[in-house]
Amino acid sequence: FERTRSLQDPCSNCPAGTFCDNNRNQICSPCPPNSFSSAGGQRTCDICRQCKGVFRTRKECSSTSNAECDCTPGFHCLGAGCSMCEQDCKQGQELTKKGCKDCCFGTFNDQKRGICRPWTNCSLDGKSVLVNGTKERDVVCGPSPADLSPGASSVTPPAPAREPGHSPQ
């Protein structure tokens, strides 16, 4: 079938990075500068994307693949092809429909994007809170209360049970 197809359509022999040039007897010509063809058998090459303004070049255009953009620092991409840039929030915030909002008590976000996540519930693992959580950081769980009974070797006392920032029980 492939042989039949190539006999019928000489363009099918043109590999990625070339185009089937009708002006030159359907010879496979290389894509001109700033253009590419990612599949074989194409009759034209596509113009390379230019990453301008808020968009930065993540991957240069080649004869077989388009350029890829990302966003300038302080912004992150929206969509598979990074067609828009959206402002990052700060750590300790999440982007809501109303913009960047601080994480609610009992939740944290240690990144500049994504959502606030609940603090780890240490007691579910039979552990106690060693370091209280904040908007930016999860709680740090320590040894279980049983491990801290008299004679146990731990030197770090558990945090008081009702202190602000304590993981919800």
Epitope: Q50, K52, G53, V54, T72, F75, L78, G79, G81, S83, M84, C85, E86
Partner: antibody, heavy 116, light 107 residues
């Protein structure tokens, strides 16, 4: 806060040129493309073109390609749009706007009236 | 060029009404669709970007949906300050193009 402030209204004669300025503040001017959009009285919005202040590279709407020139001066965070060979149907409000893939901040607009 | 067709071109509604404006692109624009609100004598203001993301400070009664070629702006409960003209705009390809606008008037 991020702001775009445009030059004042202009009355110009047919055949003449007009140059509208757009001064940016509150952000890194060179880091964002500036686009220009116009709106004739009682009409909708029409995209004219864009400039990348960092490189001076431009993209123009074919409709204006031979009459429009967009420039930018990064030292004073200002973009310019010059339209030549003005006709009466160029009477419009001209807006500059910052691009993130969407136009998040707009200038207040500059009314250009073409009249003899 | 990608043509953007908005409907209706105008509508009359009352405070509290649910209002829906549609925008159709002449070819696939994925989710690269933005909505703007404009009041007389003022510059347009961004409402929604990337089809459904609310710009900061925009009330949650505004929402957007769709993908490909068909998109919708919905105002769940119209408020007096929402009487304005609304424009859709595609960012898929240059030239950037706008819909013709939908004027929302008081009934």
């Amino acid at each position: 806060q991020v702001q775009l402030v445009q030059s004042g209204a202009e009355v110009v004669k047919p055949g003449a040129s007009v140059k509208v300025s757009c001064k940016a503040s509150g952000y890194t001017f060179a880091g964002f493309e500036m686009h220009w959009v116009r709106q004739a009285p009682g009409q909708g919005l029409g995209w004219m073109g864009a400039i990348d202040p960092k490189t001076g590279g431009t993209d123009y709407n074919q409709k204006f390609k031979d009459r429009v020139t967009m420039t930018a001066d990064t030292s004073i965070s200002t973009a310019y749009m010059e339209l030549s060979r003005l006709r009466s149907d160029d009477t419009a409000v001209y807006y500059c706007t910052r691009d993130l893939g969407y136009f998040d901040v707009w200038g207040q607009g500059t009314l250009v009236t073409v009249s003899s | 060029d990608i043509q953007m067709t908005q409907s209706p071109s105008s509508l009359s509604a009352s405070v509290g009404d649910r209002v829906t404006i549609t925008c159709r692109a002449s070819q696939d624009i994925r989710s690269n669709l933005n909505w703007y609100q404009q009041k007389p004598g003022k510059a347009p203001k961004l409402l929604i970007y990337y089809t459904s993301r609310l710009h900061s400070g925009v009330p949650s009664r505004f929402s957007g949906s769709g993908s490909g070629t068909d998109f919708t702006l919905t105002i769940s409960s119209l408020q007096p300050e929402d009487f304005a003209t609304y424009y859709c705009q595609q960012s898929e390809k240059l030239p950037r193009t706008f819909g013709g606008g939908t004027k929302v008037e008081i009934r």
